[in-house]
């Protein structure tokens, strides 16, 4: 699998999309997991609702949501109030039994908030973390990793 890069700005929301063959993955739940190290396991962050027919319902785990357009074949993950520690390698997965097929490998990059250079007094903070969505437009910039690029820094 090629790795697709999605860039988001710290403090804002990032939307990651993972297209797939809707017929091939018919009836399967989906998941979003975080790759732990270059060869480590992929740790589940959030999966679609147990009822496949209700996969269109956004399912939340903390600040991460997942929703599945099972007809159109697009899995969408929302990372709300993006933080530097959210950067890293992830996977979109299609689940069947105890197995998981990789739909897309995703590298999330977090860009510095351009407001960060201001004095703290000039910054606006929403009353609760959930209201970040009202304050910031969800967006993402994506590209595929070039051949030879590595998503993890080389280990010494």
């Amino acid at each position: 699998h090629n790795t697709t890069v999605f860039q988001g700005v710290a403090g804002q929301s990032l939307q990651v999309s993972c297209p797939y063959d809707s017929m091939k993955h018919w009836g399967r739940r989906k998941a979003w997991c975080r790759q732990l190290g270059e060869k480590g396991p992929c740790q589940r962050v959030v999966s679609t609702h147990n009822l496949w027919l209700l996969s269109f319902l956004r399912r939340w785990n903390g600040s991460t949501a997942i929703t599945d357009d099972t007809l159109g074949g697009t899995l969408t993950i929302t990372l709300r109030n993006l933080q530097p520690h959210d950067a890293g390698l992830y996977q979109c997965q299609s689940l069947h039994g105890s197995e998981a097929d990789t739909l897309r490998k995703v590298l999330v990059e977090v860009l510095a908030d351009p407001l960060d250079h201001r004095d703290a007094g000039d910054l606006w903070f929403p009353g609760e973390s959930e209201s970040f969505e009202d304050a910031h437009v969800e967006h993402s910039i994506s590209r595929s990793l070039l051949e030879g690029e590595i998503p993890f820094p080389p280990t010494s």
């Epitope: 147990n50 209700l54 269109f56 319902l57 399912r59 939340w60 959930e130 209201s131 969505e133």
Partner: antibody, heavy 117, light 107 residues
Framework: QVQLVESGGGVVQPGRSLRLSCAAS????????MHWVRQAPGKGLEWVAV????????YYADSVKGRFTISRDNSKNTLYLQMNSLRAEDTAVYYC??????????WGQGTLVTVSS | EIVLTQSPATLSLSPGERATLSCRAS??????LAWYQQKPGQAPRLLIY???NRATGIPARFSGSGSGTDFTLTISSLEPEDFAVYYC?????????FGGGTKVEIK
């Protein structure tokens, strides 16, 4: 904190219509799917309908399909249930519930609908 | 649709006692079963999801077990605030369905 407050219940004659509302606060309403669930007097809970966070997807229980319509106005943080052609068996307390980390993770207190002539 | 049968309908116990509530499904629901608590005039509250996971803020005295068709909710030592009606709910198959409830009352 998450708060869901239902309103619009009351006594209505069979065949008539009623619209229930559910006012949401304490969370970003536009980010969550929502349900209606009902409970007939002295009986268990029955799922009625569900709507996606953006209103594009809706599903209904067979018992209300074609008579009830679920909708939402994200600008008003409000969920609705339009109930037409009401029957005696629709008499129940109607709850709205949020679909978050789980299918029904927060519930309102409910509003009573009585269908009687 | 999947039918959930709860037993007993009523459980009469004293504070400090152990409560064991049963929920049986008409066909396998894997581990996709939740438990809710409802007090008179109040909204239902999620206790357990996916058969055995406690929801946020739920005390450790509540535990769930089972898979397939047979499930149990156990309250290890009843507190006065635990006397209520308990419902099981499956989200394995559409439509989601609920059990008829078990009332835990003070003996």
């Amino acid at each position: 904190q998450v708060q869901l407050v239902e309103s619009g219940g009351g006594v209505v004659q069979p065949g008539r219509s009623l619209r229930l509302s559910c006012a949401a606060s304490g969370f970003t309403f536009s980010s969550y799917g929502m349900h209606w669930v009902r409970q007939a007097p002295g009986k268990g809970l029955e799922w009625v309908a569900v709507i996606s966070y953006d209103g594009s997807n809706k599903y209904y229980a067979d018992s209300v399909k074609g008579r009830f319509t679920i909708s939402r106005d994200n600008s008003k943080n409000t969920l609705y249930l339009q109930m037409n052609s009401l029957r005696a068996e629709d008499t129940a307390v109607y709850y709205c519930a949020r679909a978050g980390g789980h299918l029904f993770d927060y519930w309102g207190q409910g509003t009573l609908v009585t269908v009687s002539s | 649709e999947i039918v959930l049968t709860q037993s007993p309908a009523t459980l009469s116990l004293s504070p400090g006692e152990r409560a064991t509530l049963s929920c049986r499904a008409s066909q396998s629901v894997s581990s996709y079963l939740a438990w809710y608590q409802q007090k008179p005039g109040q909204a239902p509250r999620l206790l357990i999801y996916d058969a055995s996971n406690r929801a946020t803020g739920i005390p450790a005295r509540f535990s769930g077990s089972g898979s397939g068709t047979d499930f149990t909710l156990t309250i290890s030592s009843l507190e006065p605030e635990d006397f209520a009606v308990y419902y099981c709910q499956q989200d394995s198959s559409f439509p989601p369905t609920f059990g008829g409830g078990t009332k835990v009352e003070i003996k």
